[in-house]
Amino acid sequence: AHYNTEILKSIDNEWRKTQCMPREVCIDVGKEFGVATNTFFKPPCVSVYRCGGCCNSEGLQCMNTSTSYLSKTLFEITVPLSQGPKPVTISFANHTSCRCMSKLDVYRQVHSIIRR
Amino acid sequence: AHYNTEILKSIDNEWRKTQCMPREVCIDVGKEFGVATNTFFKPPCVSVYRCGGCCNSEGLQCMNTSTSYLSKTLFEITVPLSQGPKPVTISFANHTSCRCMSKLDVYRQVHSIIRR
């Protein structure tokens, strides 16, 4: 089939914009670390890079292949307030490269670590 | 309490980067429209803006206050292949402004639309 050049160009552009790569996302600090429900952070979120985007096939998943760690200082507030907000420095995973991997490979990679 | 200027500056930067605003995201076309499981799109995802980020309080939710619609042309493939990929033009919601709203207001806004 022969397709209009404009259509092909716009589709190619969409592929590029949605490819699997590190993307800036907002991470909820409390959820990320599963902290006690009486502990809050200000700001409640931090900005880091995590792998995201789409892979070409149903059986593939966008997965990080390398990670750095970023230290960020936040205010921690514990209720009831025994003291004011205290500055805490927390390390966050920051994905630096990504790859579309088979879902089962991703599963195996994670579960072999969990089971150790 | 008196805090180091550097700490305050980095915290303020984090607030700004994680605020509720339209953010470029990848949307899975099939999931967005709940299409039949034998229908696939190439590319499977499109890039649009959707509200995201964090609000200052637990009771608030980042919600769109205005939306435009973007038309994007993709290839639609139906299995079993009775014909080759056919170009289809689909309209996607693109959030243009956002606001932190009370979760109850969000609920009311959504349900008033559903009930019409």
Partner: antibody
Framework: QVQLVESGGGVVQPGRSLRLSCAAS????????MHWVRQAPGKGLEWVAL????????YYADSVKGRFTISRDNSKNTLYLQMNSLRAEDTAVYYC????FGSGCFDYWGQGTLVTVSS | DIVMTQTPLSLSVTPGQPASISCKSS???????????LYWHLQKPGQPPQLLIY???HRFSGVPDRFSGSGSGTDFTLKISRVEAEDVGLYYC?????????FGGGTKVEIK
Amino acid sequence: QVQLVESGGGVVQPGRSLRLSCAASGFTFSRYGMHWVRQAPGKGLEWVALIWYDGSNKYYADSVKGRFTISRDNSKNTLYLQMNSLRAEDTAVYYCARDGFGSGCFDYWGQGTLVTVSS
Amino acid sequence: DIVMTQTPLSLSVTPGQPASISCKSSQSLLHSDGKTYLYWHLQKPGQPPQLLIYEVSHRFSGVPDRFSGSGSGTDFTLKISRVEAEDVGLYYCVQSIQLPLTFGGGTKVEIK
């Protein structure tokens, strides 16, 4: 010893829903991926779904995608299969199975629970 | 999807005699990590399946040494050196190199 006990099966009409449970004991449930596998009467085995140790990712067979949902509650050591829009071809014994190697396959199976979809 | 083909469909064996079941996959089950993701399960009458062999040739705990697995790539074999009455049932091979996990159609082993 590893024990998996399924429950929740029964007779249901086409189009209706059913939720299966699988109670796990004898191992640290929260560290293992878990599967559902089914077997139609007199037929072979068919893989249905797989869930990560923490429930963060779920994978499904095409035959159930969009209708079935696998989930887990690690605090209760329980695996679930929510089955919606049931069809006659979903009639089978449903087994839960543990992935003991982290390799995507099964080492221990439950006894199974029979689901019959019939009008 | 990977298609798993088992032969024979059924097997009638005299106690004490050997038995052999073949399983062929439509794609290689050898992974780049060096492992081959092929497993054998036995389903005794009225019971759930039980794991016999993992990754082609490793016997699972408690499995008698009369059971052995061999093969590579796309061709695999399960052997029972001396069949006993308790070995009757349906034998299934299954691959887990990619989703969806797929089973062979099963081989029924009975005693003569």
